[in-house]
Interface confidence: medium
């Protein structure tokens, strides 16, 4: 079934990072608009992005209600200038999205090194805990709150003067590593969910941070700090 001069959406794709979740689709509309519906497998459909000319819809508010649920969305196509009419019995064309389970499928955002501090031959590297749009009791939860022990970080570190990388892993947001005295090191971190077996088990690497830069040095203690 269909509505005059409208085509069904296609290429419905979920784009999700740290639970910020957007449904994208094609085609760019010429003479039609779209409405999106989302539901859990057992729930009712809820309409979002009413009669939009965009080809994306932010569904974050819906999926953060329960990130472990599996969601399905569908995109309806209506003629441009459409006003909902009680007299219309014809169902507009629509297309279903793939199923989407945020907890398993959201991409891990690029982490940030919050600080590093050297004391003698040890360096403490701290990863910034990212906030998500998942809420509990009107409080936003951090990535660590949501994933708990499912989330680890991998640290890559190397002497500024060489290219040989070493790695360390942590179940928390802190690393304590051994370094050679008098050497400057560079650091990069990656968020990982080891239990995932898909391409989205790792984030992209954080920006590289290096010791010995003027904005990171504390003359009084000889420690190196870098704060964003």
């Amino acid at each position: 079934s269909g509505t005059t001069n409208t085509v069904a959406a296609y290429n419905l794709t979920w784009k999700s990072t740290n639970f910020k979740t957007i449904l994208e689709w094609e085609p760019k509309p010429i003479n039609q608009v779209y409405t999106v519906q989302i539901s859990t497998k057992s729930g009712d459909w809820k309409s979002k992005c009413f009669y939009t000319a965009d080809t994306e819809c932010d569904l974050t508010d819906e999926i953060v209600k329960d990130v472990k649920q599996t969601y399905l969305a569908r995109v309806f196509s209506y003629p441009a200038g459409h006003v909902e009419s009680t007299g219309s019995t014809e169902e507009p064309p629509y297309e279903n999205s793939p199923e989407f389970t945020p907890y398993l499928e959201t991409n891990l955002g690029q982490p940030t090194i919050q600080s590093f501090e050297q004391v003698g031959t040890k360096v403490n590297v701290t990863v910034q805990d990212e906030w998500t749009l998942v809420r509990r009791n009107d409080t936003f939860l951090s990535l660590r709150d949501v994933f708990g022990k499912d989330l680890i970080y991998t640290l890559y570190y190397w002497k500024s003067s060489s290219s040989g990388k070493k790695t360390a892993k942590t179940n928390t947001n802190e690393f304590l590593i051994d370094v050679d005295k008098g050497e400057n090191y560079c650091f990069s971190v990656q968020a990982v969910i080891p239990s995932r077996r898909t391409a989205n088990r790792k984030s992209t690497d954080s920006p590289v941070e290096c010791m010995g830069h003027e904005k990171g040095e504390s003359r009084e203690t000889g420690h190196h700090h870098h704060h964003h």
Partner: antibody, heavy 124, light 108 residues
């Protein structure tokens, strides 16, 4: 109702290895973390480390070089080994279940089931 | 390491009185990972509160938890004879998981 039953040698000499085992009755190892905690006489609680059913471990850095926690899923039990013991390791040792409880978007963690404790004395 | 400092060390009260126990963390702790335990002599600790303010199964409603960040509180609204014990706070968010030094609630 899940119960933890623990056993092991109660009297050790310095430099020996402490070995304790905790059996899980009425429930599965899967889906939980399994911890060891100790309490020196008249003092507070100290977390030693934990293991998941898959064998992933986390240890207290202050004890890491001497501690091994292992799991035997076929027997539904987990074990603690602490090497090179000294008098400072004299304590009541508890095993406990660390439960990850998922609610409204995030995890809570808490130790909701405990063994009765095993008194370990290190003395020459 | 996150250090949890409990105060007071000892609280001397009578049955029926209100007890307020404090737990202060050396750095911010997610409330998801903050728990309170009760321990009586010769017994293992018993879970009272998890997630800073949720009562564990079977815990009477005279026990309540509150707080966030670095300051957490356990309140016993009306002390019963069986409540006289040592109380520990614990954080399970950052390795090593740590316990406070304990507050002993004793009969006055």
């Amino acid at each position: 109702q899940v119960q933890l039953q623990q056993w092991g040698a109660g009297l050790l000499k310095p430099s020996e290895t402490l070995s304790l085992t905790c059996a899980v009755y009425g429930g599965s190892l899967s889906g939980y973390y399994w911890s060891w905690i100790r309490q020196p006489p008249g003092k507070g609680l100290e977390w030693i480390g934990e293991i998941g059913a898959s064998g992933s471990t986390r240890y207290n850095p202050s004890l890491k070089s001497r501690v091994t926690i292992s799991v035997d899923t076929s027997k539904n039990q987990f074990s603690l080994k602490l090497s090179s013991v000294t008098a400072a390791d004299t304590a009541v040792y508890y095993c406990a279940r660390d439960t990850p409880y998922y609610y409204e978007g995030g995890y809570y963690y808490y130790m909701d089931v405990w063994g009765k404790g095993t008194t370990v004395t290190v003395s020459s | 390491e996150i250090v949890l400092t409990q105060s007071p060390g000892t609280l001397s009260l009578s049955p029926g009185e209100r007890a307020t126990l404090s737990c202060r963390a050396s750095q911010s702790v997610s409330s998801s990972f903050l728990a309170w335990y009760q321990q009586k002599p010769g017994q293992a600790p018993r879970l009272l509160i998890y997630g800073a303010y949720s009562r564990a199964t079977g815990i009477p409603d005279r026990f309540s938890g509150s707080g966030s960040g670095t300051d957490f509180t356990l309140t016993i609204s009306r002390l019963e004879p069986e409540d006289f014990a040592v109380y520990y706070c614990q954080q399970a968010g950052v390795v090593p998981y740590t316990f406070g030094g304990g507050t002993k609630v004793e009969i006055k």
